[in-house]
Amino acid sequence: MGARRLRVRSQRSRDSSVPTQCNQTECFDPLVRNCVSCELFHTPDTGHTSSLEPGTALQPQEGSALRPDVA
């Protein structure tokens, strides 16, 4: 079973070489390269164990099959 992979940039803001620091009520999102609210954590139960490693996400298809890796 594969995981769809997204290239994500390093944890730095667009306008600075300093890593983005989020406050206690926020999470860093590498896709948007910014802090977002994460008071309500949301990980839908898809019946799969999804790694939250940077750039990795499971992508269920019909029948909960997974798509192969995409570079």
Epitope: L31, L40, H42, T43, L52
Partner: nanobody, 121 residues
Framework: EVQLVESGGGVVQPGRSLRLTCAAS????????MYWIRQAPGKGLEWVSY????????YYADSVKGRFTISRDNSKNTLYLQMNSLRAEDTAVYYC??????????????WGQGTTVTVSS
Amino acid sequence: EVQLVESGGGVVQPGRSLRLTCAASGFTFSTSGMYWIRQAPGKGLEWVSYISSSSSTIYYADSVKGRFTISRDNSKNTLYLQMNSLRAEDTAVYYCVTQSCGAGKCYPGVWGQGTTVTVSS
């Protein structure tokens, strides 16, 4: 079962508009941040836009800024992407994706099946 069903794709001429819709079910849509992510033919995935659960925070990729508008209707469990001034380079499969957060970071979670947008004259 978590389901995301995209619609609204099609063939359109450059400069025209399309509106993509994502119908969500099987989870609490109103508390989930959502992404639109696309994949052009033969290319990698590209994040397009993000909207927070309450629509208070919205981000766009530089390539679509000023042309695309993301929105959501939590009462209808629906996510939208209004695409204006379409270009050939917008041709791609567009995916509606949930946001999953944990350990201080957020990443894509569950993906829809995608809807194809083709911009061609």
